[in-house]
Interface confidence: low
């Protein structure tokens, strides 16, 4: 059973002769009269295993210990640290020539874990030990222990375990703890990649090349990577990894943003608080959502502030001018937040009896500079019927107004166009044709202008050529022309008048009147 | 230092309403939620559910829901409890008790600061 | 709810000896459990959160212990300041409830 001690984290032990409860049992040779295994107390009342010689007095020693079968776990290379005392020679009377002050470390590699003796042919030296200066002073109880300390490393291995053994030639020896590791490089997170334990290489100057793994919740930057030097310390960290969105390092893990925080992309930066205008329910948040009635527009960066749209254009003026209208507002009141605020011109042609019948005015309507992403605050629109009436609504619009429409976004006027001159009378026509009589009847204009005042007919015989016409003018939309010749072409014009003046006089109808005392009916433009 | 101060006692009939303060001091009032616990005489603690300092939103245990209302005033850093239509069983001391609202270490929660309680009482 | 059981509900103890104080949950709370201390007038004291750490300030004869359904509150040896009653508190999922207290009698 091996009890824990703390070495450092990147030895691993494979024996620590303090860690073994009970008697060691390691096979001495001769099997009496050179090692021994002799408990000791220390000043904490744990008992320490030694193994003692002590043969100065007689000449030739050649006396053996050696350990248990010792695994490699993998390990190449293998360090021994051996804490011992050592009697000064001189310090023991009448040892002269007899009495020495070293004694060798021996190893042999075996992939049998139970051999009984010692076979001294086997074993190969790893080197000659001696004691120096350099011991600490040890408290056992009512003795102080000189205790040297020596390390030596042996490789490269390739069995599947060792045995050590210790040579004697004459010496006074204590030894009071054998302890054999391995170093590695402990397993570490460096630029937020993990990498594993690593055994150190077989020779005490190579590298050995290691490539990280991305901890939780990151992402490879550039390949990370790191080499292991024969000390089991990490050298020479190349690439890294980045905490993905939703997380920032904090003591070398990407932990998820706290709540109210984000993070949008896989970066080293930290969380950042959310914009404003926006919150996040859940750790881990890669945006904010936004508060309720602001929005993000799809290129507003997750950084950018939660936005609105605007409220309505202020201080709507209208000036008339015949069939053209200036508009001329003020920016709103509230912007949203946004720079991109422009303007987009409604126009909807509405009926003077009843102004909710509205349809929109089409495409004849001519606006400058434009109709729809205005920039300015003022707009012209020509091209508009004349004496009609119209609503125009400035609608304030900027990046997230499509996600919100909302009607207090537009401010809207209705105006009256001028009264124009009436359109030209497309239809005239002779409805009944005596010998000395026409009656005439016509159409509205298509385009009346405004309130058509009256409407005048002139006409004249064919053969006059319009040298000497007459004028009759009507309220209503028909008239009976009499006093004419009997059997004579005559030609018939007629226009309407608005306020405004007349209109353009309608293509000729040429009518020829009857020769008999009857009446000829007629509808079509030219009767004969 | 860090202390929650809560408004003094209040003796009210059955039917009536009381609005109890707690006021935060020594530290940022909307980086801890602010929680309610009622003690009846000579029984346990029993939690009242919270408010979260930051949006105002509360949350109310089954048994307080309805007749109960957290309420907060950041700008004198004050959360505030209301019992509308009170009965004799109302009868208590209610404390006021914070929790950090954000995690930054440990996810492990506790009170560890309370305020010194305040007894309502309702007798007619 | 998670229901919070503390026994005994009484505990007499001499001056310098150790108390011993449980509190089951009526499901896993994952080490989710806080120990409070109050003596009469006074506000609730945190003692132990996260089933064993000490609070700020709190002696170090106060420790907590447990897992799972069963913890356990130690006072390794009562002084005359720490006869008062003892309450356990989950934070796993809401409603956080209390134990219904221990309280801690001189013998």
């Known amino acids: 059973v091996t009890g824990s001690r703390v070495y450092p984290a990147n030895e691993v032990t494979l024996l620590d002769s303090r860690s073994v409860q009970g008697e060691l049992g390691w096979i001495a040779s001769p099997l009496e009269g050179g090692w021994e295994e002799v408990s000791i107390m220390d000043e904490k009342n744990t008992p320490i295993r030694t193994y003692q010689v002590c043969n100065v007095m007689e000449p030739s020693q050649n006396n053996w210990l050696r350990t248990d079968w010792i695994t490699r776990e993998g390990a190449q290379r293998v360090y021994i640290e051996i804490k011992f005392t050592l009697r000064d020679c001189n310090s023991l009377p009448g040892v002269m020539g007899t009495c020495k002050e070293t004694f060798n470390l021996y190893y042999y590699e075996s992939d049998n874990d139970k051999e009984r003796f010692i076979r001294e042919n086997q074993f190969v030296k790893i080197d000659t030990i001696a004691a120096d200066e350099s011991f600490t002073q040890v408290d056992i109880g009512d003795r102080i222990m000189k205790l040297n300390t020596e390390i030596r490393d042996v490789g490269p291995l390739s069995k599947k375990g060792f045995y050590l053994a210790f040579q004697d030639v004459g010496a006074c020896i204590a030894l009071v703890s054998v302890r054999v590791f391995y170093k590695k490089c402990p397993l570490t997170v460096r630029n937020l990649a993990q990498f594993p334990d690593t055994i150190t290489g077989a020779d005490t100057s190579s590298l050995v090349e290691v490539r990280g793994s991305c901890v939780n919740n990151s992402e490879e930057k550039d390949v990370p990577k790191m080499y292991c030097g024969a000390d089991g310390e990490w050298l020479v960290p190349i690439g890294n990894c980045l905490c993905n969105a939703g997380h920032e390092e904090r003591s070398g893990e990407c932990q998820a943003c706290k709540i109210g925080y984000y993070k949008a992309l896989s970066t080293d930066a930290t969380c950042a608080k959310c914009p404003p205008h926006s919150y996040s329910v859940w750790e881990g948040a890669t945006s904010c959502t936004c508060d309720r009635g602001f929005f993000r527009a799809d290129n507003d960066a997750a950084s950018m502030p939660c936005t609105r749209p605007p409220s309505a254009p202020l201080n709507l003026i209208s000036n008339v001018n015949e069939t053209s209208v200036n508009l001329e507002w003020s920016s709103p009141q509230n912007t949203g937040g946004r720079q991109d605020i422009s303007y987009n011109v409604v126009c909807k042609k509405c009926g003077a009896g009843d102004p909710s019948k509205c349809r929109p005015c089409g495409s004849g309507v001519h606006y400058t500079p434009q109709q729809n992403g205005l920039k300015t605050t003022k707009v012209s629109i020509t091209d508009l019927l004349a004496h009609t009436n119209y609503t125009f609504e400035i609608w304030a619009v900027n990046g997230v107004s499509k996600y919100n429409p909302n009607p207090d976004q537009s401010v809207s006027v209705t105006v009256t166009t001028n009264q124009a001159a009436p359109s030209s009378i497309a239809l005239v026509q002779a409805k009944e044709v005596t010998r000395y009589s026409v009656a005439l009847a016509w159409l509205e204009p298509d385009r009346p202008n405004g309130v058509i005042l009256e409407y005048e007919v002139k006409y004249y015989e064919k053969d006059q050529n319009e040298r000497s016409y007459r004028i009759v003018r009507t309220a209503a939309r028909n008239t009976d022309i009499k006093g004419l010749n009997p059997l004579t072409s005559y030609v018939f014009h007629v226009r309407a008048r608005t306020a405004a003046g007349y209109g353009d006089f309608s293509e000729p109808l040429e009518v020829t009147t009857n020769t008999v005392p009857s009446r000829i009916i007629g509808d079509g433009a030219n009767s004969t | 230092q860090i202390q929650l101060v809560q408004s003094g006692s209040e003796l009210k009939k059955p039917g009536a309403s009381v609005k109890v303060s707690c006021k935060a001091s020594g530290y940022t009032f909307t980086d801890y939620s602010m929680h309610w616990v009622r003690q009846a005489p000579g029984q346990g603690l029993k939690w009242m559910g919270w408010i979260n300092t930051e949006t105002g939103e509360p949350t109310y245990a089954d048994d307080f829901k309805g007749r109960f209302v957290f309420s907060l005033d950041t700008s004198v850093s004050t959360a505030y409890l209301q019992i509308s239509s009170l009965k004799a069983e109302d009868t208590a001391v209610y404390y006021c008790?914070?929790?950090?609202?954000?995690?930054?270490?440990?996810?492990?929660?506790?009170?560890?600061?309370w305020g010194q309680g305040t007894t309502v009482t309702v007798s007619s | 709810e998670i229901v919070m059981t503390q026994s005994p509900a009484t505990l007499s103890v001499s001056p310098g000896e150790r108390a011993t104080l449980s509190c089951r949950a009526s499901e896993n709370i994952y080490r989710n459990l806080a120990w409070y201390q109050q003596k009469p007038g006074q506000s609730p004291r945190l003692l132990i959160y996260a089933a064993t750490n000490l609070a700020d300030g709190i002696p170090a004869r106060f420790s907590g212990s447990g897992s799972g359904t069963e913890y356990t509150l130690t006072i390794s040896s009562l002084q005359s300041e720490d006869f008062a009653v003892y309450y356990c508190q989950h934070f796993w999922g809401t409603p956080w409830t209390f134990g219904q207290g221990t309280k801690v009698e001189i013998k």
């Open positions: 008790a914070r929790i950090p609202l954000y995690y930054y270490g440990s996810r492990y929660w506790y009170f560890d600061v």
